[in-house]
Every structure is written in structure tokens, then in C-alpha cells.
Interface confidence: medium
């Protein structure tokens, strides 16, 4: 289980029309539900229960979007549609690029991502808890504009990234 | 079908109070944020409050020029959300919409048909 | 707080596109969202997140945002498209969802 770092960029836009970015950066870890690659895309937050519907428009962005799902309680949710990695493919199927779960509230779903599986998904799957699932949640729930850089070594000066 | 329908509307004098229902149907009520959007005739749009989910805190929040004065609550077994308005004043005049949430978006892809809630003396 | 400010109103050619625009200081920082509303009917949602178009809105219903204004474009306006729309954003400090003043399309003809 590698060590993921992750840099999530809030893009506030100026009068002139530039933008300033705020890199913040955290760490993550890859699980062995997916792939150990890098990755970057606009940050869409996703309710586990928004995952469950096979024909639900409403999450279906262009590809190239990083999925953040904030896992409930088991107890909140004790009989989900789908398990945890069910639901990271879904977000896939959908165009996500990678999936950062918040796995504070249910720490379970660690083990049900890195049981490993016959057929794990070709992009990254990332968990998060703790302080480093804080600062993420944080920026997500602005509902600003925010773009995620997922690597798997750590990131060199962020203003080699995001060139607008 | 997916619907929310509001009820309880009607003429008030200011001062006194009035409770809106709204009714859901056809989705998972609890699952979901809910939001009070009202409109003066002839105005446009204007946003009065919301409610969360249970599952994420079944916060309210208020616009200003409401806040202390309306109460948003809901009754998950019943798939009712209220609003209850009290001190009421003329310029709360308006028909009044509940409005669902996309997840964690607050953008409202369902809304009820409104209901007129009048001031006056 | 942000304020959201739109033409009172817009016209335009059956056929032809229509842009509506809605502007508040780093407007481009947020997610807005557009809404029609035809007279004695409630808002219909008509794109989410700048340029998301709900399942059942026709295509040439579209949107961008940049910088300090947002724009929700119409092409090939149909008669349908008369109506008003609003612009909206959630404003996170504190919570509560900002409106437009909104904007009159007029379908000529």
C-alpha cells in the first residue's frame, strides 16, 4: 500500500480574470482496489447513496473528473446497493479519472479496498482518513472550483503544476 | 414519478404565523437536502433556507432576512418537510417552492408547483 | 457575499442563439447553475455545475463560466425558450444560495 500524494488546488478567480491557485497537499494511500498511477482532474463530490442509481445522469461528467466520496457509518447505511469497491467502479464507469474515498467515519472499508481483486480498476483508488480526510473535506465542501493532482512520489514545487 | 408538492398557503395578517408543507414522492426522501425558495409577485427568485439530510446532519440554515423567524424541519417516516413561519410580514409575501438538492450540489433539480402565502392586513 | 446581476432582458430570433449573462465578482471561483421559468410554473433546472445539462434538457442548452461572468448560451432558439432564467450560486460563507435578478428572453416573431 504505497503512499499517495495528493495536492488539491482551489482556483479563485481574480477582477482581471486570472486565476490564483491555493495548492494544499496531503497524503493518501493507494489501495490495491486499483491502480498505482498518477492522476489529476476537477474534484466532483459524490454521495455513496448518488453511486447506487445505474442510470443516474446526474453524476455523468465528461471524463477525466476525480470522484470524492465521503463513506458514511456502516451503521447509517446497513445494507448498501453496492460494496465500497463496487461503488469505485461506478464512479469510473462514469468517467472518473480516480477515486479518493474518505474513510474516517467507516476505517472497514480499508480492508474491503485492499483484499485485493482478480480484476482491479486500471485508474487510482485512494483512501484518506485522519487530518489529511479534514483538509479535504474542507476545501470540497466550498463547492468551488478545485482540481486534484494524485502521485505516487511527492510532489515537487506545485507551481510546476497547473499551468493555466 | 418524482414530485413535491407544497401545501398550506394562504392569506395571513402580519404578525401571525402559518406552517408550508411540502410532500415528497417517487424518490428516497431521506436521502436527500431540501431547500425553501420563495417569490414575490412579479420578483424573482429568492432563497430562504435548507435542511440537510439526516445522514448529513440534518443541519438548517437561513437567509438573513428570515433567520429567527422561520424554522425548516422534516419528518423522514412521513416524507414531509415544513417550513414554519412565524412574525410574519408584509414583505414576506410570496409563493413559496421546496426544492430538492442534487448531492452535495446545491443545485434543485426537483421542485413543487408553490404555494401563495399572502400578509396582509 | 456575491451578487449575481443579469440583463433584464434578451431577445432573439426563432433559429438563432441566445446568450444570457450573469456576472459577480470571481464568479469563475463558483459552481452556477441556471434555472427557466415559464409564467405560473415552477423553475425547471436547465444546467447544474457551469456547463452540466440535466437528462430530459435539450442540447442546445449550454454554459460557461470564466472570470467574472457566466453565460447561459441557447442555440437555435425555439419558440419553447421564452421565458425567464436565473442564474445561481452556492455561497459558502456564510451558507446560503444567491439568486440573479433573472433575465426575460423574448422569442421574436
Known amino acids: 500500500k504505497e503512499t499517495a500524494f495528493v495536492e488539491v488546488v482551489l482556483f479563485e478567480s481574480s477582477p482581471s480574470g486570472d486565476y490564483t491557485t491555493y495548492t494544499t497537499g496531503l497524503t493518501g494511500r493507494f489501495s490495491r482496489a486499483g491502480a498505482t498511477l498518477s492522476a489529476e482532474g476537477e474534484i466532483v463530490q459524490m454521495h455513496p447513496l448518488g453511486l447506487c442509481n445505474n442510470n443516474d445522469e446526474e453524476d455523468l461528467y465528461e471524463y477525466g473528473w476525480v470522484g470524492v466520496v465521503k463513506l458514511e457509518q456502516p451503521e447509517l447505511d446497513p445494507k448498501p446497493c453496492l460494496t465500497v469497491l463496487g461503488k469505485a467502479k461506478r464512479a469510473v464507469q462514469r468517467g472518473a479519472t480516480a477515486v479518493i474515498f474518505d474513510v474516517s467515519e467507516n476505517p472497514e472499508a480499508i480492508d474491503q479496498l485492499n483484499q485485493g481483486s482478480e480484476d482491479p480498476l486500471k485508474r487510482p483508488v485512494v483512501y484518506v482518513k485522519g487530518a489529511d480526510a479534514i483538509k479535504l473535506m474542507n476545501i470540497v465542501n466550498k463547492q468551488k472550483v478545485a482540481r486534484a493532482r494524485i502521485q505516487h512520489r511527492p510532489p515537487r514545487q506545485p507551481t510546476e503544476y497547473f499551468d493555466m | 414519478e418524482v414530485q413535491l408538492v407544497e401545501s398550506g398557503g394562504g392569506l395571513v395578517k402580519p404578525g401571525g404565523s402559518l406552517r408550508l408543507s411540502c410532500a415528497a414522492s417517487?424518490?428516497?426522501?431521506?436521502?436527500?437536502?431540501i431547500h425553501w425558495v420563495r417569490q414575490a409577485p412579479g420578483k424573482g427568485l429568492e432563497w430562504v433556507g435548507r435542511?440537510?439530510?439526516?445522514?448529513?446532519?440534518?443541519?438548517?440554515e437561513y437567509a438573513a432576512p428570515v433567520k429567527g423567524r422561520f424554522t425548516i424541519s422534516r419528518d423522514d417516516s412521513k416524507n414531509t418537510l415544513y417550513l414554519q413561519m412565524n412574525s410574519l410580514k408584509t414583505e414576506d409575501t410570496a409563493v413559496y417552492y421546496c426544492?430538492?438538492?442534487?448531492?452535495?450540489?446545491?443545485?434543485?433539480?426537483?421542485w413543487g408547483q408553490g404555494t401563495l402565502v399572502t400578509v396582509s392586513s | 457575499d456575491i451578487e449575481l446581476t443579469q440583463p433584464p432582458s434578451v431577445s432573439v430570433s426563432p433559429g438563432q442563439t441566445a446568450s444570457i449573462t450573469c456576472s459577480g465578482d470571481?464568479?469563475?471561483?463558483?459552481?452556477v447553475h441556471w434555472y427557466q421559468q415559464k409564467p405560473g410554473q415552477a423553475p425547471v433546472l436547465v444546467i447544474y455545475?457551469?456547463?452540466q445539462r440535466p437528462s430530459g434538457i435539450p442540447e442546445r442548452f449550454s454554459g460557461s463560466n470564466s472570470g467574472n461572468t457566466a453565460t447561459l448560451t441557447i442555440s437555435g432558439t425555439q419558440a419553447e425558450d421564452d421565458a425567464d432564467y436565473y442564474c445561481?450560486?452556492?455561497?459558502?460563507?456564510?451558507?446560503?444560495?444567491?439568486f440573479g435578478g433573472g433575465t426575460k428572453l423574448t422569442v421574436l416573431g
Open positions: 455545475r457551469n456547463k
Open positions: 435542511i440537510k439530510s439526516k445522514t448529513d446532519g440534518g443541519i438548517t
Open positions: 417517487g424518490f428516497t426522501f431521506s436521502d436527500y437536502g
Open positions: 426544492a430538492r438538492a442534487i448531492y452535495y450540489l446545491e443545485a434543485f433539480d426537483v
Open positions: 445561481a450560486v452556492w455561497d459558502d460563507e456564510p451558507h446560503h444560495d444567491v
Open positions: 470571481s464568479l469563475g471561483s463558483y459552481y
